[in-house]
């Protein structure tokens, strides 16, 4: 006999990276017929929803209207059908951004390079942080973590046209509190015409969507959570 129900899906809209003082919605999707959903924050009960009528609802939403460092951390949800509880969802790491300062991102030897050249990004922030994150805009979750007292370097090695794109970096004060994003640096990698045509840029969101950070970690923010890309989430663990 089944002792628990399948775990629900949990995600954040518009994104798990939330600028401070902005709104975020935590979504939990379980099964039709669930009479109760519980949202847990850092292991403690945070919110409860008892949807009505339960047979017509399989997803609930929990609002955080004003993101701050106290609300940043790990969330999970569970649901109940009758007396039977589900397994807990995966952990959702909610990150508050736009904290304190803005790092500077630079690239060596420069933003325009030839395929095969070694490229290194440098992220610098003069305030108290020792962890840095380099993110490439787009849907394929190019995220790297680096360390340094005031600067971290991110060697990309010999680049190909697949490295083309727009990069930004963050300073991280802890796993769930990040700085403002740096100004973008667009890396242009030129190769021979044949190679270039065979290696298009990653599909990216329009530049103005950076403000809500719809950029890198989910598979296009699709609701098919079987396609969820955990790269940046795993980076936080």
């Amino acid at each position: 006999q089944q002792q628990t129900l399948p775990k629900p899906f949990i995600w954040a809209e518009p994104h798990f990276m939330v600028p401070k003082e902005k709104q975020v919605t935590i979504c939990c999707q379980g099964n039709y017929g669930a009479v109760e959903y519980q949202l847990h924050f850092e292991g403690s009960l945070f919110a409860v929803d008892r949807p009505k009528p339960p047979e017509r609802i399989n997803k609930v939403q929990f609002y955080i209207p004003d993101m701050n460092s106290r609300m940043a951390g790990q969330y999970s949800c569970i649901y109940r059908v009758g007396e039977l509880w589900s397994e807990p969802s995966n952990l959702l790491d909610l990150v508050v951004t736009e904290m304190y300062d803005t790092p500077t991102l630079s690239v060596h030897p420069g933003p325009e390079v030839i395929s095969g050249e070694k490229v290194t990004f440098y992220c610098r922030l003069d305030t108290a942080t020792s962890m840095f994150l380099l993110l490439k805009e787009g849907r394929s979750s190019h995220v790297q973590r680096g360390y340094g007292k005031v600067q971290a370097e991110f060697p990309l090695g010999p680049v190909t046209t697949a490295h083309r794109g727009t990069y930004r970096c963050f300073g991280s004060y802890n796993n769930h509190a990040w700085s403002f994003p740096s100004e973008p640096v667009k890396l242009l990698v030129t190769g021979d015409i044949e190679n270039t045509s065979l290696a298009p840029e990653d599909p990216t969101f329009p530049a103005d969507t950076w403000g809500t950070y719809l950029l890198t970690t989910e598979t296009g923010l699709q609701k098919d959570h079987a396609l969820w890309d955990h790269t940046a989430q795993n980076l936080l663990r």
Epitope: Q23, V48, D49, P51, V60, F62, Y63, P65
Partner: nanobody
Framework: EVQLVESGGGLVQPGGSLRLSCAAS????????MGWVRQAPGKGLEWVSA????????YYADSVKGRFTISRDNSKNTLYLQMNSLRAEDTAVYYC???????????????????????WGQGTLVTVSS
């Protein structure tokens, strides 16, 4: 922002009852999940009870379950906490609290952690002593 003013606190003997009230003004009270949070002398904040804006969902901390009842009257912009079978360990300042924002909260959702609340009253002291 919503302004909250609690009343009804006082001195009561163990086993006695009190009814706290919280009058709200400002943001649309009738669409806000609400709660009660308390702080015992020398202790941190402890969430006590919560109610959805429609009153369809109520939730209680284990320490008060079966003794306290939360309710609201949206036509009067007032939140209540009926406290029965009071114990010495219920002695605390009781705060009425509202979630933040002007969002379309579910009619059935409650928030069960002190950190979830944005707007707070000044508190009313409940002392349980013989």
């Amino acid at each position: 922002e919503v302004q909250l003013v609690e009343s009804g606190g006082g001195l009561v003997q163990p086993g006695g009852s009190l009814r706290l009230s919280c009058a709200a003004s400002g943001r649309t009270f009738s669409r806000l999940p609400m709660g009660w949070v308390r702080q015992a002398p020398g202790k941190g904040l402890e969430w006590v009870s919560a109610i959805s804006w429609s009153s369809s969902t109520t939730y209680y901390a284990d320490s008060v379950k079966g003794r306290f009842t939360i309710s609201r009257d949206n036509s009067k912009n007032t939140l209540y906490l009926q406290m029965n079978s009071l114990r010495a360990e219920d002695t605390a300042v009781y705060y009425c609290a509202a979630v933040g924002g002007s969002l379309d909260y579910s009619a059935t959702v409650v928030y069960t952690a002190a950190r979830a609340y944005a707007d707070w009253g000044q508190g009313t002291l409940v002392t349980v002593s013989s």
